[in-house]
Interface confidence: low
């Protein structure tokens, strides 16, 4: 394509440039040598100035950012929406699990309420916090639940004659609970189930949130000056020759994009691995690795553990009577 | 929440769990998400091609711009000349990713490691320790309804886990969402730069 003749005007370039930037003073009236141009290197007179070139570079980089954002829009929507859905759904599961457990106490062990409600509430609050990333130890949570429940079970059901809320004996009972394994292997069972299912749930949510962070990072990438120059040559340098209608060659576009996206494309390997690893995790999220299954069945396991205590009640009362005698004597004096 | 009716599924007098007809379990929602995510598995490698197909590129035109001049669309010059005597594309690639990209790659590596560590090995759903301690009370067979509790008095069965009810807060069928899925090989009606 021959360059415009020296007597030609830059009218069309002016009207096109006006769309990008108010300030026609930047556009030459007639083609100029353009010796100061750094990107749209002219083969003859040109309708572009250095200022126009800078504006084109800025626009090209902005265009690129917008194209990138529109490319990731659906993916971003998918992950953000699902992260929100799962977070709320998990909270709902926890709420229902708490309500099931409270209902079980109310219907089967009314004498243990309202203290049991308090301990159950604390336990499930910790469960929620753990899922959201709090630095809480699951074994400690389960131990705390049974440590708190046992003194109430002992003083309300097994030995109702004792004065209520005896701090000394409560401390002794909490210790005895672990030493004597008063709930059998149920606390250990609950620990294993709860910790496995909650760990998986927590990492699942963390992974979704990281997915959002990955998209956000690439969405807001600032492209390099070199990339801006390449994009300008591809999208806008034709304007300097008055070629408003021509479009970049397909192969040329691919070469430029690969250059601009070289850094971003490096994410690809890890992104693929991320999706496949997440799939593997999800495939394993059932039975004891599914918090929905575990937490909603928890009230049943707690019920079984209390029945276990009741079954061994006589033997336990005698042993604890001896073990915590010192505390009781002090209390009666 | 709009997910579930606020009233509990429990009739407190007899501790009966209402059987909500099957809508959608959390696990099916998870699997659905993974399927949709897998359609984006090539997202990053396909980006350059996707962006070219969604920006003005000569498709049906005889002539196209190669960065320096108008050339025949299928000529050797179509991809080559535009890059000559300008800045080295190889150099641009050699610079390596931006610090933010390197950071996000590190985070991805970390989460991938965690995900692999947490993934349940195939065929080993229950730990040996649990088998030994006996899981009978809470673990019902796959084919039957999932049990909550043993058959003791006052215990109940909840049919096939907690349900997603119809009142889901968001319609997550993303098929109608903006954008297109398989970014790698989609060609949009290209935007012909004109003069409107």
């Amino acid at each position: 394509q021959p360059p415009p003749p020296p007597d030609a005007t830059c009218h069309q370039v002016r009207s096109f440039f006006q769309r990008l930037q108010p300030g026609l003073k930047w556009v030459p009236e007639t083609p100029v040598p353009g010796s100061d141009l750094q990107v749209c290197l002219p083969k003859g007179p040109t309708c572009c100035s250095r200022k126009m070139e800078e504006k084109y570079q800025l626009t090209a980089r902005l265009n690129m950012e917008q194209l990138l954002q529109s490319a990731s829009m659906e993916l971003k929507f998918l992950i953000i929406q699902n992260a929100a859905v799962f977070q709320e759904a998990f909270e709902i599961v926890v709420r229902h699990a708490k309500n099931y457990t409270n209902a079980m106490f109310k219907n089967n062990y009314p004498s243990l309420t309202p203290q049991a409600f308090e301990f159950v509430g604390e336990f499930f609050t910790d469960v929620s916090l753990y899922i959201l990333g709090s630095d809480i130890n699951v074994d400690d949570m389960v131990n705390e639940l049974f440590d708190s429940l046992f003194p109430v079970i002992y003083t309300q059901m097994m030995n109702p004659g004792l004065p209520e809320s005896v701090l000394d004996i409560n401390e002794c009972l909490r210790g005895a609970r672990r030493d004597l394994k008063v709930f059998g292997s149920f606390p250990k069972l609950i620990m294993t189930q709860v910790s496995k299912s909650l760990q998986v749930t927590r990492i699942f949510l963390q992974a979704l949130n990281l997915g959002i962070e990955v998209i956000n990072t690439t969405d807001h990438l600032k492209f390099s000056k070199d990339c801006g120059r390449m994009l300008t040559r591809m999208w806008y340098c034709s304007y300097c020759q008055g070629l408003m209608m021509v479009k970049p060659c397909g192969g040329y576009c691919n070469v430029v994009m690969q250059g601009c996206m070289a850094g971003v494309v490096e994410i690809d390997k890890y992104w693929r691995e991320y999706i496949l690893s997440l799939e593997e995790l999800v495939n394993g999220m059932y039975r004891i690795y599914d918090m929905e299954n575990v937490l909603l069945g928890l009230f049943s396991t707690i019920h079984d553990s209390i029945q276990y205590v009741q079954k061994n009640g006589g033997k336990l009362t005698t042993t604890i009577g001896k073990l915590c005698a010192h505390s009781q004597q002090r209390q009666y004096r | 929440s709009a997910y579930y009716p606020e009233d509990l599924f429990i009739d407190k007098k007899i501790l009966k769990v209402a059987h909500v007809e099957h809508e959608e379990t959390l696990s099916s929602r998870r699997r659905e998400l993974i399927q949709k995510l897998k359609s984006f598995i090539n997202f990053y490698s396909a980006l350059p091609g996707y962006i070219c197909s969604h920006s003005p590129v000569a498709e049906n035109d005889t002539l196209c711009w190669n960065g320096q001049e108008l050339v025949e669309r299928y000529s050797q010059k179509a991809a080559r000349n535009g890059m000559k005597n300008q800045f080295n594309l190889h150099e641009l690639k050699m610079k390596g990713p931006e610090p933010v990209v390197s950071q996000i790659i590190d985070k991805l590596k970390h989460i991938n490691q965690l995900l692999r560590t947490m993934s349940v090995p195939k065929g080993k759903v229950l730990d040996k320790s649990l088998d030994e301690e006996g899981l009978e009370s809470g673990d019902c067979g796959d084919d039957e309804d999932e049990c909550i509790g043993s058959s003791g008095d006052g215990m109940v069965k909840v049919k096939n886990q907690l349900r997603f009810l119809a009142e889901l807060a968001y319609d997550l069928d993303v098929d109608d969402a903006p954008g297109n899925k398989q970014h790698g090989n989609q060609k949009d009606n290209e935007i012909t730069t004109s003069h409107s």
Partner: antibody
Framework: QVQLVQSGAEVKKPGASVKVSCKAS????????ISWVRQAPGQRLEWMGW????????KYSQKFQGRVTITRDTSASTAYMELSSLRSEDTAVYYC?????WGQGTL | EIVLTQSPLSLPVTPGEPASISCRSS???????????LDWYLQKPGQSPQILIY???HRASGVPDRFSGSASGTDFTLKISRVEAEDVGVYYC?????????FGGGTK
């Protein structure tokens, strides 16, 4: 798929104003200008004006200067054309056009 | 402003036959870059105009190759090598050299 979707038909009394919207999708809205063209029954197409979707700059046809206002909302990828002091001869189908794509028209 | 005069006003054609529409400009539409800033549009019944040819002779994406445009000074011609039933409508020429953009009167 590039699409320009315009608002529905309007009936106005002489002297009133009308505002027509044009929602763009399928391309980067701020990258191109949007023209407004009208077509009165049995008349040729008539260019009214243009807006730079990127910076909001406008250019109007002398014929409509003072009566037409073209605006845009980048967050909604939408351009608007408001025509005031309506007369009976303003009865027409109004089109928005960007690049080589046209809206479906608003009567 | 630039005035565009189209002829004929109406053009009955049998499918399979060629057709030719003329558009004369009141002044040159030749830009210094060598392109003629004239476009051809087709408006099918009940539809919006759609681009056929831009810059005098460049066929737009997706336009069948039976459509072609040519220029000779201020005279522009749109040719259809073999008319098909779906080509029914009003054909307009439009100049994009300067504002206001102007259109021809149309050929049915």
């Amino acid at each position: 798929q590039v699409q320009l979707v315009q608002s529905g038909a309007e009936v106005k009394k002489p002297g009133a104003s009308v505002k027509v919207s044009c929602k763009a999708s399928g391309y980067t809205f701020t990258s191109y200008g949007i023209s407004w063209v009208r077509q009165a029954p049995g008349q040729r197409l008539e260019w009214m004006g243009w807006i730079n979707a990127g910076n909001g700059n406008t250019k109007y046809s002398q014929k409509f200067q003072g009566r037409v206002t073209i605006t845009r909302d980048t967050s909604a990828s939408t351009a608007y054309m408001e025509l005031s002091s309506l007369r009976s001869e303003d009865t027409a189908v109004y089109y928005c056009a960007t690049v080589v794509y046209w809206g479906q028209g608003t009567l | 402003e630039i005035v565009l005069t189209q002829s004929p006003l109406s053009l009955p054609v049998t499918p399979g036959e060629p057709a030719s529409i003329s558009c004369r400009s009141s002044q040159s539409l030749l830009h210094s870059n060598g392109y003629n800033y004239l476009d051809w549009y087709l408006q099918k019944p009940g539809q919006s105009p759609q681009i056929l040819i831009y810059l005098g002779s460049h066929r737009a994406s997706g336009v069948p190759d039976r459509f072609s445009g040519s220029a000779s000074g201020t005279d522009f011609t749109l040719k259809i090598s073999r008319v098909e039933a779906e080509d029914v409508g009003v054909y307009y020429c439009m100049q994009a050299l300067q504002t206001p953009l102007t259109f021809g009167g149309g050929t049915k």
